[in-house]
């Protein structure tokens, strides 16, 4: 699983990069999005 | 290999109803979000709807909201697209696809013919 | 809106090599976007996805002629050691979710001819 964490941490990714891979993962283990 | 073949295509009425099938194998059909895109004939590409993996989240463009439902049997490992009050704009190639951890449209199916016509 | 705009044709000579481009809307520059081929009378077939550093990874079966770059707004696809193979339709596509709502846009596609 990718935690929120390690998204907000990782540099260099756009707002809507980050957004699109929580989205992705949604889309595999429907964890809710909002 | 990820194989996706769909079906159900077929000339229709305009107002009338059609259901089309993607039947999947060679992977997991449980565990990816899947998703429907058609290519109206010499045109280029749109998205027409989402679905998650155990098919509680459902996605739809304005275009087809209201009209079209995306739905899935885990069990059949298929995909199905039923597609209400259809109209000359529908007619399209509609394929399947399915998603990545990594991308939204990894993998394609050869698509089905919809002819929306009187 | 989120937009994506494509030249609509391209071509180069078998063995040479062409850059493609896609180009975001301008308050959409920072985006990662999908690039995509469509051989004619076949289904499209994922190449790669593209983030506005530059870094890209690859579908099943893409060779590594196929590379990808970003510049601002703009988002490259190359492809050297052009092959008769390669003569397609290419299209760029990018989704965002606003407001647990998600959205898709296609490019309207380049046409690749392969001079022979």
């Known amino acids: 699983a990718v935690s929120e964490h390690q998204l907000l941490h990782d540099k260099g990714k756009s707002i809507q990069d980050l957004r699109r891979r929580f989205f992705l993962h949604h889309l595999i283990a429907e964890i809710h999005t909002a | 290999q990820v194989q996706l073949v769909e079906s159900g295509g077929g000339v229709v009425q305009p107002g009338r109803s059609l259901r089309l099938s993607c039947a999947a194998s060679g992977f997991t059909f449980s565990s990816y979000g899947m998703s429907w895109v058609r290519q109206a004939p010499g045109k280029g590409l749109e998205w027409v709807a989402t679905i998650s993996s155990g098919g509680s989240y459902t996605y739809y463009p304005d275009s087809v909201k209201g009209r079209f439902t995306i739905s899935r049997d885990n069990s059949k490992n298929t995909l199905y697209l039923q597609m209400n009050s259809l109209r000359a704009e529908d007619t399209a190639v509609y394929y399947c696809?399915?998603?990545?951890?990594?991308?939204?449209?990894?993998?394609w199916g050869q698509g089905t013919l919809v002819t929306v016509s009187s | 809106q989120l937009v994506l705009t494509q030249s609509p044709s391209a071509s180069a000579s078998l063995g040479a090599s062409v850059k493609l481009t896609c180009t975001l809307s301008?308050?959409?520059?920072?985006?990662?976007i999908e690039w995509y081929q469509q051989q004619p009378e076949k289904g499209p077939r994922y190449v790669m996805d593209l983030k506005q550093d530059g870094s890209h990874s690859t579908g099943d079966g893409i060779p590594d002629r196929f590379s990808g770059s970003s510049s601002g707004a703009e988002r490259y696809l190359t492809i050297s050691s052009l092959q008769s193979e390669d003569e397609a339709d290419y299209y760029c596509g990018v989704g965002d979710t606003i407001k647990e709502q998600f959205v898709y846009v296609f490019g309207g596609g380049t046409k690749l001819t392969v001079l022979g």
């Open positions: 301008s308050q959409h520059s920072t985006y990662t």
């Open positions: 696809a399915r998603q990545t951890t990594m991308t939204y449209f990894a993998y």
